[in-house]
């Protein structure tokens, strides 16, 4: 009696169980009663990344340098290139298929985390004690200058852009 | 029911190429694979190579950098080319449907000789 | 390449008489499926080569059950019963299982 299921790596067709193809490999001939499964290995710059019946490779995907994307790991016939985006680019999703500038922290924000080419740069408020007077991607909040280490006193108070100012302590009485 | 027939040049000069021509009915060479297979007089007999039905081809290592297998589907054809021939390439030839191994061509004897 | 080596390469059998042809070939010819296969062809003078035996045991439709193949991994054989005058031919052994395909020099079947 034919089979209804076939075996892990198995296909059902024509009333029997085939191999699938390996990894790297593609079906060119379905298995009959006097062969097995036939398949031939993904050409250069294709893939297969499962056991599969595919009668295709799937091409490598592209990483467009004019969309920012460089190679991050050289696909093989078994696995995907994988691209990443260049020094001061980010992917604009999981798949990386472009690019945007990394996102700079405006003043009175700090980097949380800096960017890479995958993620954007995470930024956050500066809390009290502590400015940023820049826009940067990289720059942390900085801690207000302690004026009374220096031997002076705050003549103007920070904010969460401004750094404190200090000046001489008055000597009147 | 599957049928197939070799036709070619019986005689063929050593160091020009054979070419011969399988035609076959009663199955799809969109769907099916075509092998080619050999047998000099009174010898064995050799695995040429195959093409697959979406035009792969796979081809014996001996024979590999001679040999070429093509299809035109439209026409139900398959085509063997052998090039620099030499007297130790005679011998008939046979195609053979994938899957149909009890169907075998009659065979065509091509001869390399000057 | 799989070497097929079958043997006798001759075999002169009286009619009725069994007959047996041994094939080895010099790997495995155990897919990684389970499956093995090894064919034995009968050809006939004059005739293309026919197919009696396929995945090492199993009779292709019509041929007589007199014929029967055995065998696993490396070492197989072809049995005929009793030997009738059409059984007359060159046998071969072949195995689809690793590409090339490889077929054995053949064994002449002969009436005494």
């Known amino acids: 009696e034919p089979p209804t299921a076939c075996r892990e790596k198995q296909y059902l067709i024509n009333s029997q169980c085939c191999s699938l193809c390996q990894p790297g490999q593609k079906l060119v001939s379905d298995c009959t009663e006097f062969t097995e499964t036939e398949c031939l290995p993904c050409g250069e710059s294709e893939f297969l990344d499962t056991w599969n019946r595919e009668t295709r490779c799937h091409q490598h995907k592209y990483c467009d340098p004019n969309l920012g994307l460089r190679v991050q790991q050289k696909g093989t016939s078994e696995t995907d290139t994988i691209c990443t985006c260049e020094e001061g680019l980010h992917c604009t999703s999981e798949s990386c298929e472009s690019c945007v500038p990394h996102r700079s922290c405006l003043p009175g924000f700090g980097v949380k985390q800096i960017a890479t080419g995958v993620s954007d740069t995470i930024c956050e408020p500066c809390p009290v004690g502590f400015f940023s007077n820049v826009s940067s991607a990289f720059e942390k909040c900085r801690p207000w200058t302690s004026c009374e280490t220096k031997d002076l006193v705050v003549q103007q108070a920070g904010t969460n852009k401004t750094d404190v100012v200090c000046g001489p302590q008055d000597r009147q009485r | 029911q599957v049928q197939l027939q070799e036709s070619g040049p019986g005689l063929v000069k050593p160091s020009e190429t054979l070419s011969l021509t399988c035609t076959v009915s009663?199955?799809?060479?969109?769907?099916?694979?075509v092998h080619w297979i050999r047998q000099p007089p009174g010898k064995g007999l050799e695995w040429i190579g195959v093409?697959?039905?979406?035009?792969?081809?796979n081809y014996n290592p001996s024979l590999k950098s001679r040999v070429t297998i093509s299809k035109d589907n439209s026409k139900n054809q398959v085509f063997l080319k052998l090039s620099s021939v030499t007297a130790a390439d005679t011998a008939v030839y046979y195609c053979?449907?994938?899957?149909?191994?009890?169907?075998w061509g009659q065979g065509t004897l091509v001869t390399v000789s000057s | 390449d799989v070497v097929m080596t079958q043997s006798p390469l001759s075999l002169p059998v009286t009619l009725g008489q069994p007959a047996s042809i041994s094939c080895r070939s010099s790997?495995?010819?155990?897919?990684?499926?389970?499956?093995?296969?090894l064919q034995w062809y009968l050809q006939r003078p004059g005739q293309s080569p026919g197919l009696l035996i396929y995945?090492?045991?199993n009779r292709f439709s019509g041929v007589p059950d007199r014929f029967s193949g055995s065998g696993s991994g490396t070492d197989f054989t072809l049995k005929i019963s009793r030997v009738e005058a059409e059984d007359v031919g060159v046998y071969y052994c072949?195995?689809?299982?690793?590409?090339?395909?490889?077929f054995g020099q053949g064994t002449k079947l002969e009436i005494k």
């Open positions: 053979l449907g994938h899957g149909h191994f009890d169907v």
């Open positions: 009663g199955f799809s060479l969109p769907t099916s694979g």
């Open positions: 093409i697959w039905a979406g035009g792969d081809t």
């Open positions: 790997q495995s010819l155990v897919h990684s499926s389970g499956n093995t296969y």
């Open positions: 995945k090492v045991s």
């Open positions: 072949s195995q689809t299982t690793h590409v090339p395909w490889t």
